[in-house]
């Protein structure tokens, strides 16, 4: 004699997060009398998803009219699916009684949820580093499912190979996170460079997500200094310039010292920008030679981005014999870099 069968035709169903999942279930008979119930999971800890007889299930709707005479389709639609909804769903026929008793269960339908990874967030080192140094960048993305995911690193379009990636957790989970650390060697030309973390996942339909970090936030290019003496501007005056070249970021303070004594301090303002993103700046000092009896040591001292000062000196030779009207002061450039 034929007995009621509970048919769940789909072994598995995959749904994108935010969409609705339709779980199919039909029975072959209207007897015995009693409700259909849907559960997630099996055993005593199973979770009730829907009960035809009673209860309020705001996310669940029946696909066909459950009150319709002769209805044998107990498929349900679950709205606004999240990764937490993943699991195996069982359609179970109960027999009317006091209490209702489980009569027969379907084979189950495994619901997997495709959840997009969050936008990758790339973060660099806390402190700036100078060219030739290796710095680490991290990339994180969360909340994706299934677990399979691909992560790539690029610097200015060139794929990087020195990185390590972990996907957590290792075991089964409703959703996963990825964490990757890449090592990047800085060069002086990296002010305009970008490091890109690219994440590809089945939910993204071939359009990967990217997170970027600008190396301008990471790099510090120290300046080169050059002190030169210009031709005499006026009687007894010498113009000495300090060329500060190829520095980044712009934060820079320059101090002129005359024989070790502070003459003037200024902050870089009207800088010029180079093609590579670094800056140049020039400061000059007018030295009244007649005010000096002895040779003058001029020092251009630069403090860049809070780092220890870098300096370059220039010696002005003041002649021992009395000066003649309009005569040039002999000056010799014996500059040296001092730190």
């Amino acid at each position: 004699e034929e007995e009621l069968q509970v048919i769940q035709p789909d072994k598995s169903v995959s749904v994108a997060a935010g969409e609705s999942a339709i779980l199919h279930c039909t029975v072959t008979s209207l007897i015995p009398v009693g409700p259909i119930q849907w559960f997630r999971g099996a055993g005593p800890a199973r979770e009730l998803i829907y009960n035809q007889k009673e209860g309020h299930f705001p996310r669940v709707t029946t696909v066909s009219e459950s009150t319709k005479r002769e209805n044998m389709d107990f498929s349900i639609s679950i709205s606004n699916i999240t990764p937490a909804d993943a699991g195996t769903y069982y359609c179970v026929k109960f027999r009317k009684g006091s209490p209702d008793t489980e009569f027969k269960s379907g084979a189950g339908t495994e619901l997997s949820v495709r959840a997009k990874p969050s936008a990758p967030v790339v973060s660099g080192p806390a402190a700036r580093a100078t060219p030739q140094h290796t710095v680490s960048f991290t990339c994180e993305s969360h909340g994706f499912s299934p677990r399979d995911i691909t992560l790539k690193w690029f610097k200015n379009g060139n794929e990087l190979s020195d990185f390590q990636t972990n996907v957590d957790p290792v075991g089964e989970s409703v959703s996963y996170s990825i964490h990757s650390t890449a090592k990047v060697v800085l060069t002086r030309e990296d002010v305009h460079s970008q490091v890109i973390c690219e994440v590809a996942h089945v939910t993204l339909q071939g359009d990967p997500l990217r997170g970027t970090a600008n190396l301008s936030e990471t790099i510090r290019v120290p300046p080169t200094l050059e002190v030169t003496q210009q031709p005499v501007r006026a009687e007894n005056q010498v113009n000495v310039t300090c060329q500060v070249r190829k520095f980044y970021p712009q934060r820079l303070q320059l101090t002129w010292l005359e024989n070790g004594n502070v003459s003037r301090t200024e902050t870089a303002s009207t800088v010029t920008e180079n093609k590579d993103g670094t800056y140049n700046w020039m400061s000059w000092l007018l030295v009244n030679v007649s005010a000096h009896r002895d040779d003058v040591k001029l020092t251009c001292q630069v403090e860049h981005d809070g780092q220890p000062a870098v300096s370059k000196s220039h010696d002005l030779k003041v002649s021992a014999h009395p000066k003649e009207q309009g005569s040039n002061t002999a000056a010799e450039n014996t500059g040296s870099n001092e730190r």
Partner: antibody, heavy 115, light 111 residues
Framework: RSVEESGGRLVTPGTPLTLTCTVS????????ISWVRQAPGKGLEYIGT?????ITYFASWAKGRFTGSKTSTTVDLKITSPTTEDTATYFC????????????WGPGTLVTVSS | ALVMTQTPASVSAAVGGTVTTKCQAS????????LAWYQHKPGQPPKLLIY???TLATGVPSRFSGSGSGTQFTLTITGVQSDDAATYYC???????????FGGGTEVVVK
């Protein structure tokens, strides 16, 4: 879809009587058949439902007084030992209540129990 | 066991009028909605009108409606027609599958 009763007749008390419900247009493997009776001048009275072997049940007052069986297209209701109180028109109907209500019904068959 | 008490036993209504019959269960019916209404005319089989307390059976005119839950149920005929003269029965289902009980019936006379 239809059901029709047969087998109603005059019997003496204690003489077993079998009523048959013949169905067409639906399968007995997916529908129960319920029996209801109406004694002269009285209201409707539910007797029981015959489904598959394990799913056959009778109202508490009817247990032991009736048995049920079925074939692929017929359902039998046996009155095991009729008494005069069993005189009634007997109806069979497709369905087993709750979300499977009794519908359609047969025209009924009259059983008279008299000595 | 479930007991279904149906009132009134008889009611008279004019064509176009409204008729209500009530059914009270001795305990909550199964699922709070295991209640059907049947129309029975002499010499004919009963006819299903309403099931699951308020669901109109196929082909039944919309002037018939059912309401209620738990223990109290009502059948309403709005705009009574002469063809509605009949006896109306409620059928309640208890928690056990064999616990199906008819009410005593309400005879509707149409003037």
């Amino acid at each position: 879809r239809s059901v029709e009763e047969s087998g109603g007749r005059l019997v003496t008390p204690g003489t077993p009587l079998t009523l048959t419900c013949t169905v067409s247009g639906f399968s007995l493997s997916s529908h129960g058949i319920s029996w209801v009776r109406q004694a002269p001048g009285k209201g409707l009275e539910y007797i029981g439902t015959i489904g598959t072997g394990v799913i056959t049940y009778f109202a508490s007052w009817a247990k032991g007084r009736f048995t049920g069986s079925k074939t692929s297209t017929t359902v039998d209701l046996k009155i095991t030992s009729p008494t005069t109180e069993d005189t009634a028109t007997y109806f069979c109907a497709r369905g087993s209540a709750w979300n499977d209500p009794f519908d359609p019904w047969g025209p009924g068959t009259l059983v008279t129990v008299s000595s | 066991a479930l007991v279904m008490t149906q009132t009134p036993a008889s009611v008279s209504a004019a064509v176009g009028g409204t008729v209500t019959t009530k059914c009270q269960a001795s305990q909550s019916v199964y699922g709070n909605n295991d209640l059907a209404w049947y129309q029975h005319k002499p010499g004919q089989p009963p006819k299903l009108l309403i099931y699951l307390a308020s669901t109109l059976a196929t082909g039944v005119p919309s002037r018939f409606s059912g309401s209620g839950s738990g223990t109290q149920f009502t059948l309403t005929i709005t705009g009574v027609q002469s063809d509605d003269a009949a006896t109306y029965y409620c059928l309640g289902g208890g928690d056990d599958e064999a616990d199906n009980v008819f009410g005593g019936g309400t005879e509707v006379v149409v003037k």
